[in-house]
């Protein structure tokens, strides 16, 4: 079992760009998590 205690949202915005010529979207990073502001110096969300 992993001992990771927190997720790791990037400190910058995740990208969300439509793929050219299709109706699908492309994402990067931890796009599926809630976009909550982490405390300074931390990647933690509650």
């Amino acid at each position: 079992v992993s001992s990771v205690q927190t997720p790791h949202l990037p400190t910058h915005a995740d990208s969300q760009t439509p793929s050219a010529g299709t109706d699908t979207q492309t994402f990067s990073g931890s796009a599926a998590n809630a976009k909550l502001n982490p405390t300074p110096g931390s990647n933690a969300i509650s």
Epitope: V1, S2, V4, T6, P7, H8, L9, P10, D14, S15, T24, Q25, T26, F27, S28, G29, S30, A31, A32, N33, A34, L36, I45, S46
Partner: antibody, heavy 116, light 109 residues
Framework: QVQLVESGGGVVQPGRSLRVSCEAS????????MHWVRQAPGKGLEWVAV????????FYADSVKGRFTISRDNSQNTLSLQMSSLRAEDTAVYYC?????????WGQGTLVTVSS | KIVMTQSPATLSVSPGERATLSCRAS???????LAWYQQRPGQAPRLLIY???TRATGIPARFSGSGSGTEFTLTISSLQSEDFAVYYC??????????FGGGTKVEIK
């Protein structure tokens, strides 16, 4: 502590349906994207599906698109995968995993065997 | 779709030695969103490294990740008995789909 517990696996005939579930505890479930990842016997890992933290977006691997449906109930801290038109190649251990795009916690998995 | 290729498929190493595992992407992984997982026999995978080089909480310092673009490396500085396992890389720089490498089995020499 974070816990993910899968259930619902078993033996099913080709063409039939099965629903597997994942019960989450130890964290705020509604803040996290959730995934299903599978592993065929003796093989590597294959991402199956993701659902956004709030259920607003769902995406699937091409191999299961149109046959599998991912869903979540944030009031019950549960994740589900409804599998239909099952094929022999869907035989695998199915893991639920937490994360926005990578997977920081995994359940222990539930085995789905598709066989006549 | 970004295809991830790991090499070698099997790595035979003696305890205490260094192991270097390679992961190559078919196109550049934006943001260096590359993760490494360890899977011991009969167990679920465990996150080791995310963002190409950041150790997950509780992961020993002997595990380190490096690389950028299309070439990434996981290094285990001094192999312990519990480190003999299969290791997978995974990109989350452009998805869906999220894609894994085929794995590298680290076995006792």
């Amino acid at each position: 502590q974070v816990q993910l517990v899968e259930s619902g696996g078993g033996v099913v005939q080709p063409g039939r349906s099965l629903r597997v579930s994942c019960e989450a505890s130890g964290f705020t479930f509604s803040n996290y994207g959730m995934h299903w990842v599978r592993q065929a016997p003796g093989k590597g890992l294959e991402w199956v599906a993701v659902i956004w933290y709030d259920g607003s977006k769902k995406f699937y691997a091409d191999s299961v698109k149109g046959r599998f449906t991912i869903s979540r109930d944030n009031s019950q801290n549960t994740l589900s995968l409804q599998m239909s038109s099952l094929r022999a190649e869907d035989t695998a251990v199915y893991y639920c995993a937490r994360g926005g795009g990578d997977f920081d916690f995994w359940g222990q998995g539930t085995l789905v065997t598709v066989s006549s | 779709k970004i295809v991830m290729t790991q090499s070698p498929a099997t790595l035979s190493v003696s305890p205490g030695e260094r192991a270097t595992l390679s992961c190559r992407a078919s196109q550049s992984v934006s943001g260096n969103y590359l993760a490494w997982y360890q899977q011991r026999p009969g167990q679920a995978p465990r996150l080791l490294i995310y963002g190409a080089s950041t150790r997950a909480t509780g992961i020993p310092a002997r595990f380190s990740g490096s690389g950028s673009g299309t070439e990434f490396t996981l290094t285990i500085s001094s192999l312990q008995s519990e480190d003999f396992a299969v290791y997978y890389c995974q990109q989350y720089g452009k998805w869906p789909p999220l894609t894994f490498g085929g794995g590298t089995k680290v076995e006792i020499k």
